[in-house]
């Protein structure tokens, strides 16, 4: 009778992460008697994947019933495949021995390759807000994909950006890869409603590319413009002075009125109006009793916006 051969018909198998891999193996004879074992890798450092005789292998199931006397099919299924499972798997026949079984013959091996989708891209912006005309950096990260080939694009409001740098790690062979990209974006006063989008395309994606977004509303600070105006004199020598605070973002704003350098009133912006571009306007007024002053009065509207140093605008009130 011809000597037993271990046949692994598939040189290579490609599996999607999360799926089940079937590794086929048949023997050409029932003799010699002894168990089959599956290993990943060859040589002394090989990893035991399945032992017909003993052990607990929760992810592995056999295709056939190995307890049947005439069984020669030693194929296995490995469930919930991850990129870490990639490698060459060997089906090895052992001859029954005492005290230990002796390795008799190995199959040629089946190389298992794994394709894995990239994780949803995560976009993060700068820790501190920046003002228009400044350049800020955004980062985009996606992990766990295989194979290594991947494309990443940046968009601002649908317009593709060109000022970015991308790295895919590691540079050499690996079971899975990560991508990291940094894009530079110049802020404008109209960017409160703007979005920065990182788009990742990979062979495993059946839909459109994966997208990660960042809202520039979390990054931008638009400082207010101030205008102080005097309204016509009212009865009983009262003058109404208004401070128009325009085009600011975010809403966090505190306004202080000063009369000749002395604090008259402090208030926090509450009932603001929103502009189409997402910035806010607010108006504060001060009623000044002219008869209480002998000399001209310097009125100052002082605004502290979003924790920044105060900006102010003054108005000289003539007392005739």
């Amino acid at each position: 009778e011809e000597e037993l051969q271990v046949i692994q018909p598939d040189k290579s198998v490609l599996v999607a992460a999360g799926e089940t891999a079937t590794l086929r193996c048949t023997a050409t004879s029932l003799i010699p008697v002894g168990p089959i074992q599956w290993f990943r890798g060859a040589g002394p450092g090989r990893e035991l994947i399945y032992n017909q005789k003993e052990g607990h292998f929760p992810r592995v199931t056999t295709v056939s019933d190995l307890t049947k006397r005439n069984n020669m099919d030693f194929s296995i299924r490995i469930g919930n495949i991850t990129p870490a499972d990639a490698g060459t798997y060997y089906c090895v026949k052992f001859r029954k021995g005492s005290p230990d079984d002796v390795e008799f013959k190995s199959g040629a091996g089946t190389e298992l390759s794994v394709r894995a989708k990239p994780s949803a891209p995560v976009v993060s912006g700068p820790a501190a807000r920046a003002t228009p005309q400044h350049t800020v950096s955004f980062t985009c990260e996606s992990h766990g994909f295989s194979p290594r080939d991947i494309t990443l694009k940046w968009f601002k409001n649908g317009n593709e950006l060109s000022d970015f740098q991308t790295n895919v790690d590691p540079v050499g062979e690996s079971v899975s890869y990560s991508i990291h990209s940094t894009a530079k974006v110049v802020l404008t006063r109209e960017d409160v409603h703007s979005q920065v989008i990182c788009e990742v395309a990979h062979v495993t994606l059946q839909g459109d590319p994966l997208r990660g977004t960042a809202n520039l509303s979390e990054t931008i600070r638009v400082p207010p413009t101030l205008e102080v105006t005097q309204q016509p004199v009212r009865a009983e020598n009262q003058v109404n002075v208004t401070c128009q605070v325009r085009k600011f973002y975010p809403q966090r704003l505190q306004l202080t009125w000063l009369e000749n350098g002395n604090v008259s009133r402090t208030e926090t912006a509450s009932t603001v109006t929103e502009n189409k571009d997402g910035t806010y306007n607010w108006m504060s007024w001060l009623l000044v009793n002219v008869s209480a002053h002998r000399d001209d009065v310097k009125l100052t509207c002082q605004v502290e916006h979003d924790g920044q140093p105060a900006v102010s605008k003054s108005h000289d009130l003539k007392v005739s």
């Epitope: 394709r115 194979p147 062979v203 495993t204």
Partner: antibody, heavy 116, light 109 residues
Framework: VQLVESGGRLVQPGTPLTLSCTVS????????MGWFRQAPGKGLEYIGI?????SPYYASWVNGRFTISKTSTTMDLKMNSLRSEDTATYFC?????????????WGPGTLVTVSS | DIQMTQSPSSLSASVGDRVTITCRAS??????LAWYQQKPGKAPKLLIY???FLYSGVPSRFSGSGSGTDFTLTISSLQPEDFATYYC???????????FGQGTKVEIK
């Protein structure tokens, strides 16, 4: 799992025509689908794909002449102003479950003849 | 666009022969290459994907190899049902577009 193309016929130059690809055994919302064509005695030519979410992508030569769309069970190829060089068998195909780099299921094709 | 050059355009062979068809890409496509078999009046059938993986149900006499720009389809022992036209098809991961080779017709000698 099956794909069947329909709508192919003899048309005059300048005429529009819409081909359909009806699928069974799987969901169009899970796979990228493609359209291809093959002129008589010639090789295979890629026309375009539609992603699982419904976004179409076209070969550079298409130049807006063709439009790919889909419903829950059919994918359509709308062809404007047909020319004699558009005479071909048109195939629809589905990409493999492991990635969009190959097509593992094809329809039998439908013949479009453009002639006056 | 990427160009795929297949050779030979046709070949004559006998049953039992070893047949090799090559496909060259105008730029690297890594391993994103598929091989199809097509018979007259029929749709293409997938044989090999990702350059070297045998599609389920395809006889093991078919094998694929290569990466980058040069690829090979080998039929180890030609059978009567293998007389057909064979196409390579690339996918470019940056342009996300597909290109076919012009085909190789395998005829009976």
């Amino acid at each position: 799992v099956q794909l069947v193309e329909s709508g192919g016929r003899l048309v005059q130059p300048g005429t529009p025509l819409t081909l359909s690809c009806t699928v069974s055994g799987f969901s169009l919302s899970s796979y990228v689908m493609g359209w291809f064509r093959q002129a008589p005695g010639k090789g295979l030519e890629y026309i375009g794909i539609i992603s699982s979410s419904g976004s179409p992508y076209y070969a550079s030569w298409v130049n807006g002449r063709f439009t790919i769309s889909k419903t829950s069970t059919t994918m359509d190829l709308k062809m404007n102003s047909l020319r004699s060089e558009d005479t071909a068998t048109y195939f629809c195909a589905r990409v493999g479950p492991l990635g969009v780099d190959y097509f593992n299921i094809w329809g039998p094709g439908t013949l479009v003849t453009v002639s006056s | 666009d990427i160009q795929m050059t297949q050779s030979p355009s046709s070949l004559s062979a006998s049953v039992g022969d070893r047949v090799t068809i090559t496909c060259r890409a105008s730029q690297s496509i890594n391993s994103y290459l598929a091989w199809y078999q097509q018979k007259p009046g029929k749709a293409p059938k997938l044989l090999i994907y990702s350059a070297s993986f045998l599609y389920s149900g395809v006889p093991s006499r078919f094998s694929g190899s290569g990466s980058g720009t040069d690829f090979t389809l080998t039929i180890s022992s030609l059978q009567p049902e293998d007389f057909a036209t064979y196409y390579c098809q690339s996918w470019h991961y940056i342009s996300r577009s597909y290109t076919f080779g012009q085909g190789t017709k395998v005829e009976i000698k």
